[in-house]
């Protein structure tokens, strides 16, 4: 059994999240993940989910009673989602930490917008594909 | 020329982001994107970048002077990044809108954690692969 399972059960107790009523009004993540089978689509969604959990864990970083559990789960997330690649994890963290209200960050983001847009579709790297071809792609 | 280009130039003027000094102290997104060649890795990073831009645009939604430019760019992002798939865009938006300080959201997130973790690595869908195989994956 992966180490995170025991620690996640510990967090369930701490957050009182083991009761069946927690599942009322649908799921947060599981229903969405069920919708997407293609790896690249899953990564788009999982990227947001993982950043949510990291933010959540950050909010509880001073709570000693769950420290070990949180650290073990974060370690396992880094192994599973970032394939233990610290460079990937660091680049991800940089992106999640940019402040949208910082004027310098805003100017840089707008400055880079055209190039970012040009790279957004997979076709961007293999030659330009007519936009009309893409309109109804899944 | 894609419609977003003209509108992005308009935003550059508005944000005073056309000057060369904006590029001082490195890039926000372009340097990071350059590091990642594999499509799934790019999607992890682009997911965060796109959510940043949507947040930024939201902050300026009441500014009429750039409304048309913002709408055109958002539409083009939906075409390029979400392949014009409204369901994909909607699921993405749901994920970005969850509040990490909402107690019910916290409980649900912890309730779903084990299943989310089990799906994080690509191997999860094709049968379990020994975790030891993953330590240095890209």
């Amino acid at each position: 059994q992966d180490p995170y399972v025991k620690e996640a059960e510990n967090l369930k107790k701490y957050f009182n999240a083991g009761h069946s009523d927690v599942a009322d009004n649908g799921t947060l993540f599981l229903g969405i993940l069920k919708n997407w089978k293609e790896e690249s689509d899953r990564k788009i969604m999982q990227s947001q989910i993982v950043s949510f959990y990291f933010k959540l864990f950050k909010n509880f970083k001073d709570d000693q009673s769950i420290q070990k559990s949180v650290e073990t789960i974060k370690e396992d997330m880094n192994v599973k989602f970032f394939n233990s690649n610290k460079k990937k994890r660091d680049d991800f963290e940089k992106l999640t930490n940019y402040s949208v209200t910082d004027l310098n960050v805003q100017r840089k983001a707008i400055h880079e917008l055209i190039q970012v847009m040009a790279e957004l579709s997979p076709a961007a790297k293999t030659g330009k594909r007519k936009r009309s071809q893409m309109l109804f792609r899944g | 020329q894609d419609p977003y280009v003209k509108e992005a130039e308009n935003l550059k003027k508005y944000f005073n982001a056309g000057h060369s000094d904006v590029a001082d102290n490195g890039t926000l997104f372009l340097g990071i994107l350059k590091n990642w060649k594999e499509e799934s890795d790019r999607k992890i990073m682009q997911s965060q970048i796109v959510s940043f831009y949507f947040k930024l645009f939201k902050n300026f939604k009441d500014d009429q002077s750039i409304q048309k430019s913002v709408e055109t760019i958002k539409e083009d992002m939906n075409v390029k990044f979400f392949n014009s798939n409204k369901k994909k865009r909607d699921d993405f938006e749901k994920l970005t809108n969850y509040s990490v300080t909402d107690l019910n959201v916290q409980r649900k997130a912890i309730h779903e954690l084990i299943q989310v973790m089990a799906e994080l690595s690509p191997a999860a869908k094709t049968g379990k692969r020994k975790r030891s195989q993953m330590l240095f994956r890209g």
């Epitope: 233990s84 690649n85 610290k86 | 993953m134 330590l135 994956r137």
Partner: antibody, heavy 121, light 110 residues
């Protein structure tokens, strides 16, 4: 101050076994991945095995897979390498090395002084 | 598995600048951090550069690291060479299933 002290090396016959230990101090041991790296006499460095901070993930070089086992006891701040079916080509100084983070063992920042393993009849 | 190729040896006079290259055979050099280790005779390796271009505290700023995506290689540059810089230097990176060291470069300060 970070300290890594290896022990357990020595002379062993081909086919024999040896268990190396690495006593760690000066840092929170369970928070960091650890590796074993070896260096044959007059040769370069060769990575052998690694283990994540919790011990949940392990990895091995092809040359030792199935013969060596890495483990750790976080309550004792100690890293181990169990070496079985030893061969002459396993003769080397074995270094224990600490990683910069808990989940990868690809960024080694501190090394022990090494312990010599000699496999010979 | 990929390989990291370094020159077997380099030599230069005191005060000069020397650059040691490390070329990755497959996989993007930019997608994985590169480390550089110095090993003096009879001693354990010590880190002189980590995460492509970062210097641990205590390592003089004469040591610098860089990566070049175009050539898929990393470089260690030592300026103002001193006699105590004479040592073996190893680059190191990793990929999806292993940690890999370069073969090592013997630096001789003439």
């Amino acid at each position: 101050e970070v300290q890594l002290v290896e022990s357990g090396g020595g002379l062993v016959q081909p086919g024999g076994s040896l268990r190396l230990s690495c006593a760690a101090s000066g840092f929170t041991f369970s928070s960091y991945a650890m590796s074993w790296v070896r260096q044959a006499p007059g040769k370069g460095l060769e990575w052998v095995s690694a283990i994540s901070g919790s011990g949940g993930s392990t990895y091995y070089a092809d040359s030792v897979k199935g013969r060596f086992t890495i483990s750790r006891d976080n309550s004792k701040n100690t890293l181990y390498l169990q070496m079985n079916s030893l061969r002459a080509e396993d003769t080397a100084v074995y270094y224990c090395a600490k990683d910069r983070v808990g989940y990868s063992s690809s960024l080694l920042d501190y090394w022990g002084q090494g312990t010599l393993v000699t496999v010979s009849s | 598995n990929f390989m990291l190729t370094q020159p077997h040896s380099v030599s230069e006079s005191p005060g000069k600048t020397v650059t040691i290259s490390c070329t990755r055979s497959s996989g993007s050099i930019a997608s994985y951090y590169v480390q550089w280790y110095q090993q003096r005779p009879g001693s354990s390796p010590t880190t002189v550069i980590y995460e492509d271009d970062q210097r641990p505290s205590g390592v003089p700023d004469r040591f610098s690291g860089s990566i070049d995506s175009a050539s898929n290689s990393a470089s260690l540059t030592i300026s103002g060479l001193q006699t105590e810089d004479e040592a073996d230097y190893y680059c190191q990176s990793y990929d999806r299933n292993s940690l890999v060291f370069g073969g090592g470069t013997k630096l001789t300060v003439l």
